[in-house]
């Protein structure tokens, strides 16, 4: 969490950003809030990116002003216009790319004063793994697949029966580059599993951590999955 204070004569306002991650090939949100103002026409929101000449986005007098917008952000940015009056200056970014990573500044002017805060935006790829029984194998194996990760993650397996035990000697993980030559498909096979046990496949990089659980019994298969972004620090 980054909290910035602006000084305009004696007047400053608090601006708060949340360090966040963008999943490439999806829309992303760069989070920024500020002390609300009662008059929309008095609010100016400017988003800037370190190393970029033009603006990322500008909203003033109750509407977008894209006259000074940098070429790389044309057609890709939006604020939540109906929420600005309530202090939401968050930016929506269409079709996040690796190159969108960097340091952004959310700069706010209201009738109360000025303020700004920086935001570290990380970009990568992350997806929820699916764990299945590998019926093609001669032994009881589990296959964990996740379609899109970047940067290359680490994969570990764990089981409920062996709390804290990792399976470094009995699983094999491969990474296959996807067609766009950036993200990779993750496949990990855990060998010789036992029935009536819960196994977890955990995939993690510096952006996200995802877990796929499976419990195989004689009568049924239960699955559960979870995805968590790792870098949601506020500023």
């Amino acid at each position: 969490l980054i909290i910035g204070f602006g000084i305009s004569g004696r007047h400053s306002i608090t601006v708060t950003t949340l360090t966040s991650a963008g999943n490439i090939g999806e829309d992303g949100i760069l989070s920024c809030t500020f002390e609300p103002d009662i008059k929309l026409s008095d609010i100016v929101i400017q988003w800037l990116k370190e190393g970029v000449m033009g603006l990322v986005h500008e909203f003033k007098e109750g509407k977008d002003d894209l006259s000074d917008q940098d070429e790389m952000f044309r057609g890709r940015t939006a604020v939540f216009a109906d929420q600005v009056i309530g202090g939401n200056a968050s930016l929506r970014l269409k079709n996040v790319q690796l190159t969108d990573a960097g340091t952004y500044k959310c700069y706010i002017i209201t009738s109360k004063g000025k303020g700004n805060a920086n935001l570290e935006y990380k970009t990568g790829a992350f997806s929820i793994p699916e764990v299945n029984v590998d019926y093609n194998a001669s032994s009881e194996n589990l296959r964990c697949e996740a379609p899109r990760w970047f940067p290359q993650p680490t994969v570990v397996w764990a089981s409920q029966a062996d709390q804290g035990a990792n399976f470094s000697e009995v699983f094999n993980t491969s990474f296959e580059l996807n067609s766009e030559n950036v993200t990779m498909k993750v496949v990990s096979v855990l060998y010789n599993v036992t029935i009536n046990n819960t196994y977890s496949c955990m995939i993690e990089n510096d952006i996200a951590k995802a877990t796929g659980d499976i419990k195989v019994t004689d009568s049924e298969i239960k699955r559960r999955s979870h995805l968590q972004l790792l870098n949601s620090k506020a500023s």
């Epitope: 999943n23 490439i24 090939g25 999806e26 829309d27 986005h57 509407k63 977008d64 894209l66 917008q69 952000f73 044309r74 057609g75 890709r76 940015t77 939006a78 604020v79 216009a81 109906d82 929506r92 269409k94 079709n95 790829a125 997806s127 379609p147 899109r148 996807n178 067609s179 766009e180 950036v182």
Partner: antibody
Framework: EVQLVESGGGLIQPGGSLRLSCAAS????????MNWVRQAPGKGLEWVSV???????YYADSVKGRVTISRDNSKNTLYLQMNSLRAEDTAVYYC?????????WGQGTTVTVSS | EIVLTQSPGTLSLSPGERATLSCRAS???????LAWYQQKPGQAPRLLIY???SRATGIPDRFSGSGSGTDFTLTISRLEPEDFAVYYC??????????FGQGTKLEIK
Amino acid sequence: EVQLVESGGGLIQPGGSLRLSCAASGFTVSSNYMNWVRQAPGKGLEWVSVIYGSGRTYYADSVKGRVTISRDNSKNTLYLQMNSLRAEDTAVYYCARDTYAMDVWGQGTTVTVSS
Amino acid sequence: EIVLTQSPGTLSLSPGERATLSCRASQSVSSSYLAWYQQKPGQAPRLLIYGASSRATGIPDRFSGSGSGTDFTLTISRLEPEDFAVYYCQQYGSSPMYTFGQGTKLEIK
């Protein structure tokens, strides 16, 4: 050259199924937001579906549950699987790439639903 | 659901004249996500304007876009014979994910 070429249209009976294809060249389908847009005879443009670079999909309410958008990354091809077809699905179907907007369109393929 | 309403439905003008086409949204639309397309009979649509005011590659400078919030305008400063077509505005980013206006037909007077 950046290009999209649709195929798979034709005359189909109500309740039938059809799979439309859209072959892309000059760019990678999986790096872009790829759309299907249709146009009924003498009518305006209607958005049908989108698949994001990530693989996430969205559909218009008018087709939800009846159509599935997908892609084959190895063939650089977009698909639209259409089931339970109705007379009101009769249209020219276009695929379109969306970068900052829908900047590349195919020539369209005609789907006619009639008994 | 955001509804885009284009006016007029049909616009009759002569070559050399100025055309002003309007697109009104039922609620606020981000300027970045507003685009204009041209479609001629038997052809696929062609992108003219994106981000409300940026011309797409290869589009002549007689085409310009403006507006923000709920009101957007496409202006053709001096009509050429090849400009007579149907024009659509389109927004991205709300549910449904994309919406088109019903179109304005620009015909020769």
